[in-house]
């Protein structure tokens, strides 16, 4: 692809809706940051369309995105992370639409991982723990987590708990006995950075004990 449109193509392009959204991930690969953008309309013909970011960069004026299927992507150490950058959709040298964005306000954290649930018989509760790569990061360290759980048979009846730590205790009496539960967790920047929810962690499944008939307690 040359990246340049014929005149007719350019006229057609101006009729299309090139609305796009982006998210940044800081220190996603060592000290490298990433920026991912995509068109809001999945049917946009992206042939010859390029994304470019200019401003608030270190040592360079502008950077071009790489195209990966339907998304546009940059991984670099060159984001200043101070002030606004201009992100443009371009065909050749012509900008079709641009947005001014501070990359620290569109941060999407990495998904939490190592989610697990341990039943404590003596305490009659379940201890939920998970891990996040953000504990080791310089920038996006403070996150709010959203733990969601449901009885497996209740398709859309999720219970959500927001917390800032990576440990949560669920009381046994708040859960149904002898039931299979699904639990998952996601994160969002909470202080100093703004942005979006991460992807959900992989789900973890656990079963609650049965009720002990003599005492009315769960086994």
């Amino acid at each position: 692809e040359s990246g340049y449109a014929q005149n007719g193509d350019l006229e057609d392009a101006e009729l299309d809706d090139y609305s796009f959204s982006c998210y940044s991930q800081l220190e996603v690969n060592g000290s490298q940051h990433s920026l991912t953008c995509a068109f809001e309309d999945p049917d946009v013909n992206t042939t010859n369309l390029e994304f470019e970011i200019c401003g608030a960069l270190v040592e360079v004026k502008c950077l071009n995105f790489r195209k990966l299927q339907e998304i546009y992507f940059i991984e670099t150490k060159k984001f200043l992370l101070i002030g606004k950058s201009n992100i443009c959709v371009k065909v050749g040298e012509k900008s079709l639409t641009c947005k001014k964005i501070d990359l620290t306000t569109i941060v999407k954290p990495e998904a939490p991982f190592d989610l697990s649930v341990i039943y404590r018989e003596g305490a009659n509760d379940f201890v939920v723990t998970f891990n996040t790569s953000h504990l080791q990061k310089k920038y996006v360290k403070v996150l709010m987590h959203d733990v969601a759980y449901r009885q497996e048979k209740d398709e859309n009846k999720w219970t959500h708990v927001n917390l800032s730590s990576t440990k949560l205790t669920l009381l046994q009496r708040k859960l149904q006995p002898a039931a299979m539960y699904e639990i998952k967790v996601r994160s969002i920047p909470d202080h100093y950075f703004k942005g979006f929810w991460s992807e959900w962690s992989p789900s973890y499944y656990f079963r609650t004990p049965e009720i002990n008939n003599s005492s009315g307690e769960m086994d």
Partner: nanobody, 118 residues
Framework: EVQLVESGGGLVQAGGSLRLSCESS????????MGWFRQAPGKGREFLAA????????HYSDSVQGRFTISRDNAKNTVYLQMNSLKSEDTGRYYC???????????WGQGTQVTVSS
């Protein structure tokens, strides 16, 4: 109409410290990047330090790294420059700037004079 006002400059001996303040009346202060610059006599304006909207990200020129610290208080619409181990070559007029938008600072103060005597 005055939007950025610097204060805290003065005469100080080499090795001493000063803290500059810059108060903003711009409504978007809490979402704007802020920066400090200086202009030595007969020279161009030199970038010193910048800070992101929340204070989480800072950036310094090599000439002041380790000696100067930029900080901000969004509740007071104020940005600060703590200057330690001052040298005679730090003499100049110090300016604050607001809203770093695609490599251009949109607003500038009038500056405050700093003189370091040896």
């Amino acid at each position: 109409e005055v939007q950025l006002v610097e204060s805290g400059g003065g005469l100080v001996q080499a090795g001493g410290s000063l803290r500059l303040s810059c108060e903003s009346s711009i409504s978007t202060f809490s979402s704007d990047a802020m920066g400090w610059f200086r202009q030595a006599p007969g020279k161009g304006r030199e970038f010193l330090a910048a800070i992101g909207w929340s204070g989480a990200v800072t950036h310094y020129s090599d000439s002041v790294q380790g000696r100067f610290t930029i900080s901000r208080d969004n509740a007071k619409n104020t940005v600060y420059l703590q200057m330690n181990s001052l040298k005679s070559e730090d003499t100049g007029r110090y300016y604050c700037a607001e809203d770093y938008d695609t490599d251009v600072w949109q607003y500038w103060g009038q500056g405050t004079q700093v003189t370091v005597s040896s």
